[in-house]
């Protein structure tokens, strides 16, 4: 591994240790539960593909933050606290990715079934943009993908 990466990893590690990502987890869980309440829990109802054009932030310019204020109407208290925490990673895309991966890992046991997992992942992908932040590149949210041997 390269020197910058070792230094970067250490810096990121301490950032992750300082961060409180719980509000993000709570915000996302509340969101998918609200969605389930709205649409019902029928597993056979047509669910959107997690990468469908209307859902995937990459279909828009991936670097244009969400047009609405993160404290706008309807945004939960959890979301605001979550965005404040994620803001700490704005200048380190790799670390932003690790923070999002950590959120995914922390919640993976609580997600019931493939559909709920995909829904959570979809909301997680939208989270940086909701917070007015850039979404990371080269970031795999698959929990089962295992450790990464970078370069």
């Amino acid at each position: 591994r390269q020197q910058w990466e070792l230094q970067g990893d250490r810096r990121c590690q301490s950032q992750l240790e300082r961060a409180n990502l719980r509000p993000c987890e709570q915000h996302l869980m509340q969101k998918i539960q609200r969605d389930e309440d709205s649409y019902g829990r029928d597993p056979y109802s047509p669910s959107q593909d997690p990468y469908s054009p209307s859902q995937d932030p990459d279909r828009r310019d991936p670097y244009s933050p969400s047009p609405y204020d993160r404290r706008g109407a309807g945004s939960s208290q959890h979301q605001e606290r979550c965005c404040n925490e994620l803001n700490e990673f704005e200048n380190n895309q790799r670390c932003m990715c690790e923070a999002l991966q950590q959120i995914m890992e922390n919640q993976s046991d609580r997600l019931q079934g493939r559909q709920q997992e995909q829904q959570f992942k979809r909301e997680l992908r939208n989270l940086p943009q909701q917070c007015g932040l850039r979404a990371p590149q080269r970031c795999d949210l698959e929990v089962e993908s295992g450790g990464r041997d970078r370069y």
Epitope: Q2, W4, E5, G8, Y51, D56, P57, D58, P62, Y63, N91, N92, Q93, R94, R125, R134, A135, P136, Q137, R138, C139, D140, L141, E142, S145, G146, R148, D149, R150, Y151
Partner: antibody
């Protein structure tokens, strides 16, 4: 519109080094990673590595790890590829390619016109 | 390391359908992108993110994947489709970009 303009052709002797530049316009340089891809005559595309101009972070393909250096100058919106210890096998067209996508989606919409590097004694 | 395998060449008569495959272990879990390269030119993305066709590419071109195979399909082939085609993925395990070896499409 997005433009990537590369430096001209180069001829080098075996053992020498070469530096190729890629000057960009039409977008915010630090917002996207720059990749380098090469293509030997009659061969396929080969990814060499990338640089994040915002952080200066680099990542190189295993094969080139020991002799490639990727840098960028944000004031000039320019990325550079330097390859040392050249052999005839390094004769190729070298392309810069700007990244696109988020999360697992990672591909190249914008490419430079290519720079031919010829290694010959 | 992750390897993408493409057939070196595919020949097709005008008006027929060309299918270019890209094989790799469990490619269905990867995001596959396709490029077209004409002689003396830089590659151009034709399909990104498995099946999202580039705006400059006609509807005759489409991408799909299943199991260990991703496929680029060109229907109603024209002379202008003659080119080299490459598949590409980002491999998260090694954090490397990987290209297939390329397929030369010849219109008979």
């Amino acid at each position: 519109q997005v433009q990537l303009v590369q430096s001209g052709p180069e001829v080098r002797k075996p053992g020498a080094s070469v530096r190729v530049s890629c000057t960009t316009s039409g977008y915010t340089f630090i917002d996207y990673e720059m990749n380098w891809v090469r293509q030997a005559p009659g061969q396929g595309l080969e990814w060499m590595g990338l640089i994040n101009p915002h952080s200066g972070d680099t990542g190189y393909a295993q094969k080139f790890q020991d002799r490639v250096t990727m840098t960028s100058d944000t004031s000039l919106s320019t990325a550079y590829l330097e390859l040392s210890g050249l052999t005839s096998e390094d004769t190729a067209v070298y392309y810069c390619a700007r990244s696109q996508g988020t999360f697992e989606v990672y591909y190249f919409v914008s490419w430079g016109q290519g720079s031919l590097v010829t290694v010959s004694s | 390391s992750y390897v993408l395998t493409q057939p070196p060449s595919v020949s097709v008569a005008p008006g027929k359908t060309a299918s270019i495959t890209c094989e790799a272990k469990n490619i269905v879990r990867k995001r596959v992108h396709w490029y077209r390269q004409k002689p003396g030119q830089a590659p151009v993305v034709v399909v990104s993110d498995d099946e999202d066709r580039s705006s400059v590419i006609p509807e005759r071109v489409s991408g799909s994947k299943s199991g260990d195979t991703a496929t680029l399909t060109i229907s109603r082939v024209e002379a202008g489709d003659e080119a080299d085609y490459y598949c590409q993925v980002w491999d998260s395990t090694t954090d490397q970009v990987v290209f297939g070896g390329g397929t030369k499409v010849t219109v008979l």
